[in-house]
């Protein structure tokens, strides 16, 4: 499908010689015809903002230690999260790690493991949280 694009100031993005660019709406990209846009293919590519790209950004495939939290749409990339029983700290690029089995002696669990954080333990006698 081809959509008519709209003109809009986009500032100075590095691949433009002119601050005035021709933008396609989210979920589409530039066609080979100036003034037209092509829709991204669901599950294959996406653009999450107005853009002047000649191709949609490729959808990310979740890694083997991850599961899909939400699928790739034409306007949003795939969202992946660690599989149950594993976690990775927010914004970390590391592999998913196994959740701790339990708290050290003298500590008590106050929060279960989530795909984004390990279990949380606090000292029995103190109310202060302490991550391990």
């Amino acid at each position: 499908a081809t959509i008519k694009l709209h003109d809009q100031s986009i500032g100075t993005q590095q691949w433009e010689h002119s601050p005035l660019g021709e933008l396609c709406p989210p979920g589409s990209h530039r066609s080979e015809h100036p003034g037209a846009c092509n829709r991204c293919t669901e599950g294959v590519g996406y653009t999450n903002a107005s853009n002047n790209l000649f191709a949609c950004l490729p959808c990310t495939a979740c890694k083997s230690d991850e599961e899909e939290r939400s699928p790739c749409t034409t306007t949003r990339n795939t969202a992946c999260q660690c599989k149950p029983g594993t976690f990775r700290n927010d914004n970390s690029a590391e592999m998913c790690r196994k959740c701790s089995r339990g708290c050290p002696r003298g500590m008590v669990k106050v929060k279960d493991c989530t795909p984004w954080s390990d279990i949380e333990c606090v000292h029995k006698e103190s109310g202060n949280g302490h991550n391990i």
């Epitope: 005035l20 015809h33 003034g35 000649f54």
Partner: antibody, heavy 118, light 110 residues
Framework: EVQLVQSGAEVKMPGASVKLSCRVS????????IHWVRQAPGQGLEWMGW????????GSAEKFRGRVAMTRDTSISTAYMELNRLTFDDTAVYYC???????????WGQGTLVTVSS | QSALTQPASVSGSPGQSITISCTGT?????????VSWYQQHPGKAPKLVIY???NRPSGVSSRFSGSKSGQTASLTISGLQADDEADYYC??????????FGGGTKVTVL
């Protein structure tokens, strides 16, 4: 039949500029993006940049940024590519090509030989 | 923006099939379906023979076919003919409005 007709050969001194032309015939000039590709003697193809004939906006490979300028004269269906601060390494055949569907280039101009020599 | 990797030369006898490989990265061939192939005879402009990995433009012989696996694209010429002797270049879109060519492969018909 769509044809891209390029200007004739040029000989330039190091440090000079060269402005090449590419005229589109047989179709609407503004119907497709135009790309520039060069080929040094005995070497492979090197993509230089793209040009929007409607708006005049352009983009280039990092290597050429700040040294290349792309313009057009829609009244004569012609795109121009100017390369500044020429060095001996810029000796090449320069091609213009239209962007075909699937982010590819077809058809191509016949090429313009630019020789940088002192 | 380093060039895609192609073998410098490939040869075959008339009637045989040959395959030219083109290896890129996860940012170009591995990421996009926008792989094309060009044939260039000496002193001539390049001619498109395959686009979007495996599509043939009208007028191009069905003896030319393309494929892709992971980060490597391939061009196969079947029933090799004398006129197929030329240089062949692969090309890929590599995101953010940039393109990259392979170094080229010289095809010799023995």
């Amino acid at each position: 039949e769509v044809q891209l007709v390029q200007s004739g050969a040029e000989v330039k001194m190091p440090g000079a500029s060269v402005k090449l032309s590419c005229r589109v015939s047989g179709d609407t000039f503004t119907a497709y993006f135009i790309h520039w590709v060069r080929q040094a003697p005995g070497q492979g193809l090197e993509w230089m940049g793209w040009f929007n004939p409607i708006s005049g906006t352009a983009g280039s490979a990092e290597k050429f940024r700040g040294r290349v300028a792309m313009t057009r004269d829609t009244s004569i269906s012609t795109a121009y590519m100017e390369l500044n601060r020429l060095t001996f390494d810029d000796t090449a055949v320069y091609y213009c090509a239209r962007q075909h569907r699937g982010n590819t280039f077809d058809p191509w101009g016949q090429g313009t030989l630019v020789t940088v020599s002192s | 923006q380093s060039a895609l990797t192609q073998p410098a030369s490939v040869s075959g006898s008339p009637g045989q099939s040959i395959t030219i490989s083109c290896t890129g990265t996860s940012s170009d061939i591995g990421a996009y379906k926008y792989v094309s192939w060009y044939q260039q005879h000496p002193g001539k402009a390049p001619k498109l023979v395959i686009y979007e990995v495996s599509n043939r433009p009208s007028g191009v012989s069905s003896r030319f076919s393309g494929s892709k696996s992971g980060q490597t694209a391939s061009l196969t010429i079947s029933g090799l003919q004398a006129d197929d002797e030329a240089d062949y270049y692969c090309n890929s879109y590599q995101g953010y409005n940039t393109w990259v060519f392979g170094g080229g492969t010289k095809v010799t018909v023995l």
